[in-house]
């Protein structure tokens, strides 16, 4: 079997719609978020994709400090119970609440820093995370929906005569696979792994004597990636003129 | 890392034939396929064929088809190609590539002249 | 056989200076390709495999782009010693084909 030779083209440097990847944080100034964010500030609830590994900043509703009586985190990821990090601003305390994962911290002190930071982005961090600042004039809040993605390792090898196998080995979300050219192919595998990954396998066979190379192309919200083989002859063929 | 080492330069007769030899390395010579791709001088690059040493299978492209002979031999892990009846529109470089043609050698000039 | 077409065919630039040249395969079939830089008397070198992957040792400068039928390859900042001529070659379908390449000079 030869080895599949490989292209990586990452999604970040060509697709205007995942910008938000690139960045670690939405914690911008007010000008900023509203200049490249319009619903930000209008939005009580933003959906934010985090890729695994990276380090992650949530930051509250643009409150001045000065209005400022509780600053408090709410953080609630699957299976766990609700945990709550707070500051209380007269008596410069904070406080937290089943709170075990060390990697949810605040950026800094709160008095200096109401942001929360995550440090790095795993897993288990899919959830929901709410910022609330109490104030004289009420409550005002921001809640981030975290989807935290997987990068899937992707394989390409030739199983039998002139038939392909490309799998995307455990990706959050599902990684989506396609063919150059296109083959006869047999329906999408998924294997869902308790992690919340999910592995991704097409097999396709090419009939065609002239079809040298195939692509597998694997598109995925971190990005895409694509792998080439070339096939193996046609069994019992020896030789060719241009085949059609 | 891969390795293609050809044969020196060749000059023929208008008629006769030439064999020129590409010898691999570095890569499980009966895995991939080898190519042959030539350029006359001033011109562009032309694939010609290739040949899977696993097998012996071989594709011709048509222009070359009845003139043009690849061969393998596995205990060497060298890869042949000779073309016959040439003319002096054969003159050319003539290289040999690998690894789905991420892999060159050097190339072999062939002057076809009487 | 797939033709590819690639133009521009020569084109003369300025140090510094973006270039850009493209290759389109015939039939609407799609296709992969590589970008490779020739200089006289030199075997062709590849400098982008897979229609975007930058070849290990190739300066970033390089890039390559697109899918299906139409492909781009960019010098983001032309420098001296990239006057030769590029070509693209398709590697899907047999016969592979090769553009007739573009011929690189420095004003």
């Known amino acids: 079997e030869g080895a599949a030779q490989s292209n990586n083209s990452l999604m970040l440097q060509t697709s205007k719609e995942n910008h938000t990847l690139a960045s670690n944080s939405l914690c911008m100034d007010e000008k900023q978020i509203t200049q490249n964010h319009s619903k930000v500030l209008a939005e009580v609830n933003i959906s934010w994709p985090v890729q695994m590994a990276r380090n992650a900043v949530l930051c509250c509703p643009p409150i001045e400090f000065r209005n400022l009586i509780v600053i408090t985190w709410e953080i609630i990821l699957r299976g766990q119970p609700s945990c709550t990090k707070s500051y209380r601003k007269e008596t410069n305390e904070t406080k937290e609440t089943n709170c075990t994962d060390e990697r949810i911290t605040w950026v800094s002190t709160p008095d200096q820093n109401s942001d929360l930071q995550i440090h790095p982005v795993a897993i288990t961090h899919d959830g929901y995370y709410r910022c609330i600042m109490a104030t004289p004039d009420g409550n005002f809040h921001r809640g981030y929906h975290l989807q935290v993605l997987v990068t899937p390792e992707v394989t390409l090898f030739e199983s039998r005569n002139r038939t392909a196998v490309c799998k995307a080995v455990a990706g959050k979300p599902a990684a989506q696979i396609s063919w150059i050219p296109a083959g006869d192919c047999a329906p999408t595998e998924q294997e869902y792994w308790g992690n919340g990954t999910v592995t991704v396998k097409s097999t396709c066979h090419w009939e065609g004597h002239n079809v040298s190379t195939v692509t597998c192309h694997v598109s995925h919200l971190t990005g895409n990636k694509s792998l080439y083989i070339e096939l193996l002859p046609v069994p019992g063929a020896k030789k060719s003129a241009k085949l059609y | 890392q891969v390795q293609l080492v050809q044969s020196g330069a060749e000059v023929k007769k208008p008629g006769a034939s030439v064999k020129v030899s590409c010898k691999a390395s570095?890569?499980?010579?009966?895995?991939?396929?080898m190519h042959w791709v030539r350029q006359a001088p001033g011109q562009g690059l032309e694939w010609m064929g290739n040949?899977?040493?696993?097998?012996?299978?071989?594709n011709y492209d048509e222009k070359f088809q009845g003139r043009v002979t690849m061969t393998a031999d596995t205990s060497t892990s060298t890869v042949y190609m000779e073309l016959s009846s040439l003319r002096s529109e054969d003159t050319a470089v003539y290289y040999c590539?690998?690894?789905?043609?991420?892999?060159w050698g050097r190339g072999t000039l062939v002057t076809v002249s009487s | 056989d797939i033709q590819m077409t690639q133009s521009p065919s020569s084109l003369s630039v300025s140090v510094g200076d973006r270039v850009t040249i493209t290759c389109q395969a015939s039939?609407?079939?799609?296709?992969?390709l590589h970008w490779f830089q020739q200089k006289p008397g030199k075997a062709p070198k590849l400098l982008i495999s897979?229609?975007?992957n930058l070849e290990d040792g190739v300066p970033s400068r390089f890039s390559g782009s697109g899918s299906g039928t139409e492909f781009t390859f960019t010098i983001s900042s032309l420098q001296p010693e990239d006057a030769a001529t590029y070509y693209c070659?398709?590697?899907?379908?047999?016969?592979?084909?090769f553009g007739q390449g573009t011929k690189l000079e420095i004003k």
């Open positions: 590539l690998t690894m789905t043609g991420t892999s």
């Open positions: 570095g890569h499980t010579f009966t895995s991939y396929w």
């Open positions: 040949i899977y040493p696993g097998s012996g299978s071989i």
């Open positions: 039939q609407g079939t799609p296709i992969n």
């Open positions: 897979g229609a975007s």
């Open positions: 070659l398709q590697f899907t379908y047999i016969p592979w084909t």
